[in-house]
Amino acid sequence: SGTTNTVAAYNLTWKSTNFKTILEWEPKPVNQVYTVQISTKSGDWKSKCFYTTDTECDLTDEIVKDVKQTYLARVFSYPAGNVESTGSAGEPLYENSPEFTPYLETNLGQPTIQSFEQVGTKVNVTVEDERTLVRRNNTFLSLRDVFGKDLIYTLYYWKSSSSGKKTAKTNTNEFLIDVDKGENYCFSVQAVIPSRTVNRKSTDSPVECMGQEKGEFREI
């Protein structure tokens, strides 16, 4: 039910990448405002984004407290200028979000190749270990810190002049691959969480090629 001049939020959607997590919803408010609450299954509700006219709320600070918990959010609708007003049942109109478990559902952000170094016929490719907003002991954890061996990277590499392409995989952030001497190669990486069935892979990193600034070549 609710008051006649407010409508319930709908299409509540979690948007999350590398644990940066925002709840979005509709509709754009007309003469109403929203407040969001979030809780774990067993926890108390905590209010965020008080009386906002936005249709999104950044809940990162709450979910990073324990990324393996399952969270539920709800969006309350209030008449603009009369936020004390409640519905006919004695409480404001609200809508529940789907459940959200950050560890299982956050999207993997596009990775970046930090560097590559050639020594003879070997190339060491290093993937940047991106910092997340997850904290432990007052320090921000990297993606590898959070996921550990649950996260792998797939490297694709190919000769600049060729239609062939090879792959290697690692559960660290480094690859050591064999290359042909005197050939220039290009590289791209993708993050994967093999244990997942959805949101399993990132987009491919930007392509980096030998002969560009990120690389280093040493003749042995």
Partner: antibody
Framework: QVQLKESGPALVKPTQTLTLTCTVS????????VHWIRQPPGKALEWLGV???????DYSTSLKTRLTISRDTSKNQVVLTMTNMDPVDTATYYC??????????WGQGTLVTVSS | DIQMTQSPSSLSASVGDRVTITCRAS??????LAWYQQKPGKAPKLLIH???SLQSGVPSRFSGSGSGTDFTLTISSLQPEDFATYYC????????FGQGTKVEIK
Amino acid sequence: QVQLKESGPALVKPTQTLTLTCTVSGFSLTNYNVHWIRQPPGKALEWLGVIWTDGKTDYSTSLKTRLTISRDTSKNQVVLTMTNMDPVDTATYYCARDWDTGFDYWGQGTLVTVSS
Amino acid sequence: DIQMTQSPSSLSASVGDRVTITCRASQNINNILAWYQQKPGKAPKLLIHYTSSLQSGVPSRFSGSGSGTDFTLTISSLQPEDFATYYCQQAYTPYAFGQGTKVEIK
């Protein structure tokens, strides 16, 4: 649902070229890599090659001079071409979808016999 | 190229037995190892990927372990439908399978 189906000749003569087609449904060839694998009667699986999502390819070291993998994304088809066929190439040929850390869907396989 | 060596090539076991199959890679494969089950006249079926991740729908009696170069597939209590050939596979190009382990009825 996800499906792969191999088609092509059941019998080829020695020195001829084999062309097999893998027709896929339920997924896009621009989102998943597709591999070819073969298995001679009573023997182990042997990886032949792959076509990546961008159309680039990679092949078995021992067979790369004889293999070509191509695709037609509009028809959802991947094509394996193998030249200079020999009786030792008699096998069941499979295509399979790559799931990054394993092949999660396979075709039913097609038996190719090489004989004069 | 990375080669895969499976052992044993065959084994005989009874329903209810615990069965262990091993696979060794010629170099470190960073746990990128899959196990397949194949029955006569059928395509292989993915059981386990990334060393120990059970593929959806696969019974929990199947488990995988290992790291570096040495890996194991374990069937905790063999069932009648488990008599088949099992293959390991690594996913660095060029990809490679083990030579297979046939699990037969004792």
